[in-house]
Interface confidence: low
Amino acid sequence: AQEVQQSPHCTTVPVGASVNITCSTSGGLRGIYLRQLGPQPQDIIYYEDGVVPTTDRRFRGRIDFSGSQDNLTITMHRLQLSDTGTYTCQAITEVNVYGSGTLVLVTEEQSQGWHRCSDAPPRASALPAPPTGSALPDPQTASALPDPPAASALP
């Protein structure tokens, strides 16, 4: 059966830093999503070989891709406290398949010790709460910021 290998399981990074998430499959998929889990899951990117990747407006200008849809590395730049959360890869196949998830903990530089990653894969039902004031954005407002000019906006 098709599986999605996802790494890392967890990473703690300071505000402004970058993180790599890798989604690997055995092939035979149509495309791959990266989804941020939470009370209201949000699709972050969609990647399909031969097609311009699409990125949620909250992350536009902060996402890079390398590799192919079978072995895709997604780099999220200039991380903000509100980016804290679990991100899971979803492979679009005849039956959609999910990765184990990556818990991204974005912390203030002086508070690196607040949350540390364990070796266990993250579970959406057992996530540590993000630091006060950095809860995941309300989906009703997360995309309400102006977008870059049309000439530079991704499709």
Partner: antibody, heavy 123, light 110 residues
């Protein structure tokens, strides 16, 4: 060839429910966001709801929030709109439409539309 | 009441150009590059003509072009043809996960 075929419309009393379906073919359904747009008789277009390709993100117009639910079954290439607590002002032709680019709903109603299904809310 | 304001009618002779405006605010048209234009013939489903201000879907002739200045978006139809006679609607992202439409403009080819 891209085809979208809506069904499920009809006459319903105020306060009632209906479930609209939109059968899609001719494209990789799971890769595209989908929308519902309605048009009251003799009136203009009104966006109702949208859903991303995986179904992970949903969006609703204020006028239907809490009453309508959009969903999709990518294994059946079908889009749905569950409409509850219907009101007379919900009377319209309901169109489903496909986003022009794969991935996210990028705030465009769609490049391919079905022919619509009429919903009439009346006692 | 429509979120976006369009003139109720516009007209032009075959071969001429006509421009239809779509006026909003800094919270919709002026704040985002998610303006689309749709053509609808009587009794038919709408057809997307322009999206993201100026992008044309495949199959839409380059006689149709979109632009935006401040809080007003415009659709220009050049080299008017009889089949261009239809209703035209604009839409724009309006913030807070809402998509607003204009009231529509009836284009008449004289």
């Amino acid at each position: 060839e891209v085809q979208l075929v809506e069904s499920g419309g009809g006459l319903v009393q105020p306060g009632g429910s209906l479930r609209l379906s939109c059968a899609a073919s001719g494209f990789t359904f799971s890769s595209y966001a989908m929308s519902w747009v309605r048009q009251a008789p003799g009136k203009g277009l009104e966006w109702v709801s949208a859903i991303s390709g995986s179904g992970g993100s949903t969006y609703y117009a204020d006028s239907v929030k809490g009453r309508f639910t959009i969903s999709r079954d990518n294994s059946k290439n079908t889009l749905y709109l569950q409409m509850n607590s219907l009101r007379a002002e919900d009377t319209a032709v309901y169109y489903c439409a496909k986003d022009p680019d794969p991935g996210y709903f990028d705030w465009v109603a769609g490049d391919y539309w079905g022919q619509g299904t009429l919903v009439t809310v009346s006692s | 009441q429509s979120a976006l304001t369009q003139p109720p009618s516009a007209s032009g002779s075959p071969g001429q150009s006509v421009t239809i405006s779509c006026t909003g605010t800094s919270s919709d048209v002026g704040g985002y590059n998610y303006v689309s234009w749709y053509q609808q013939h009587p009794g038919k489903a709408p057809k997307l003509m322009i999206y993201e201000v100026r992008k044309r879907p495949s199959g839409v002739p380059d006689r149709f072009s979109g632009s935006k200045s401040g809080n007003t978006a415009s659709l220009t139809v050049s080299g008017l043809q009889a089949d261009d006679e239809a209703d035209y609607y604009c839409s724009s992202y309006a913030g807070s996960n809402n998509l607003g439409f204009g009231g529509g403009t009836k284009l008449t080819v004289l």
